[in-house]
């Protein structure tokens, strides 16, 4: 059977990624006509810099931050089946990208964001290490 | 203009029942929250609950929760709490307030509430 | 039950800057609020998110952060600045609004 180049595998771990992270924005952004407000009250910390894998760790901090804000949403409106399941495919998946031995100190933005500008902020960084692997 | 428009000052005894309320204009009612908020007699501010008037979902600060009870007509842009028997102790000023991006943006003018024997 | 912190009361000359601060265990998480309430008044928003301004709200009151404690300064301050101001945030949940027990900020002379 054929086997998957590791760049090609770490390609489709980040079209993965960004997919899953683009369904919790549109549902968040679902969400905005009704409770999006109670969501708003979180900080979320941004990285200074993020144009490498390693710079997921970044992101693998603040999942228990999105999991708070996903419980907040009761996932039923929300319409994700298992909200917690869902952020553990999210964490397994940033481990895979960056590796589970990564000892990367992420240094933050002064200025934390809400939830909505969190998740803008990471599919567009998502987006950007994809087309930069794909050049 | 957006506003809200509290009922007027109420004198009970106690063990009375009172319902008050916040009517809401200038704005879409149904998709904001509206947080209730309580003001002893030279005391501070302290958050009772809050209802959403879309689907009535209600949270409720743990010392209020059991105590008094939030509701919501959305044809009439109305927000209620309510008491089921009124103490002494129940005398301050209610606010209600709409709860917006995620600040209490827009106050009502309050309605006090006395209660005595 | 969750709870915000202040000082009960602070004192200031017109003119000087006033600070007034709030400390919360869930402060690094979630955002903090300031009202300011004048006697026989409802309160009124002066800082959401920290740090923002709501338009209408003058210059000289301004907002910051820094771990479990959130400050609302007043540079200048005036004698109409003279209330009582109280900061207000969520549980670590977000599923609790709290407010702090409130500032009584005195404008001397």
């Known amino acids: 059977a054929p086997t998957s180049s590791p760049a090609k595998e770490t390609q489709q771990h980040l079209e993965q990624l960004l997919l899953d992270l683009q369904v919790l924005l549109r549902g968040i952004d679902n969400y905005k006509n009704l409770k999006l407000p109670m969501m708003l009250t979180f900080k979320f910390y941004l990285p200074k810099q993020a144009t490498e894998l390693k710079h997921l760790q970044c992101l693998e901090n603040e999942l228990g931050a999105l999991q708070r804000v996903l419980d907040l949403t009761q996932s039923k409106s929300f319409h994700l089946e298992d909200a917690g399941n869902f952020i553990s495919n999210i964490r397994v998946t940033v481990v895979k990208l960056k590796g589970s031995e990564n000892k990367f100190e992420c240094q933050f933005d002064d200025e934390p964001a809400t939830v909505v500008e969190f998740l803008r902020r990471w599919i567009a960084i998502c987006q950007s290490i994809i087309s930069t692997m794909t050049q | 203009e957006v506003q809200l428009v509290q009922s007027g000052a109420e004198v009970k005894k106690p063990g009375e029942s009172l319902k008050i309320s916040c009517k809401g204009s200038?704005?879409?009612?149904?998709?904001?929250?509206i947080g209730w908020v309580r003001q002893m007699p030279g005391r501070g501010l302290e958050w009772m609950g809050t209802?959403?008037?879309?689907?009535?979902?209600?949270r409720y600060s743990p010392s209020f929760q059991g105590q008094v009870t939030t509701s919501a007509d959305k044809s009439i842009s109305t927000a209620y709490l309510q008491w089921g028997s009124l103490r002494a102790s129940d005398t301050a000023m209610y606010y209600c307030?709409?709860?917006?991006?995620?600040?209490?943006?827009?106050w009502g003018q309050g309605t006090m509430v006395t209660v005595s024997s | 039950s969750y709870e915000l912190t202040q000082p009960p009361s602070v004192s200031v000359s017109p003119g000087q800057t006033a600070r007034i601060t709030c400390s919360g265990d869930?402060?690094?998480?979630?955002?903090a609020y300031w009202y300011q309430q004048k006697p026989g008044q409802a309160p009124v928003l002066v800082i959401y998110?920290?740090?923002e301004r709501p338009s209408g709200i003058p210059e000289r009151f301004s907002g910051s952060s820094s771990g479990t404690t959130v400050t609302l300064t007043i540079s200048g301050v005036q004698a109409e600045d003279e209330a009582d101001y109280y900061c207000?945030?969520?549980?670590?949940?977000?599923?609790?609004?709290?407010f702090g027990g409130g500032t009584q900020l005195t404008v001397l002379g």
């Open positions: 307030a709409r709860f917006s991006s995620s600040a209490y943006d827009i």
């Open positions: 200038g704005y879409n009612f149904d998709t904001y929250w």
């Open positions: 209802i959403y008037p879309a689907d009535s979902d209600t």
């Open positions: 869930a402060l690094p998480r979630q955002f």
């Open positions: 998110k920290d740090t």
């Open positions: 207000q945030s969520a549980d670590s949940s977000g599923t609790y609004h709290v």
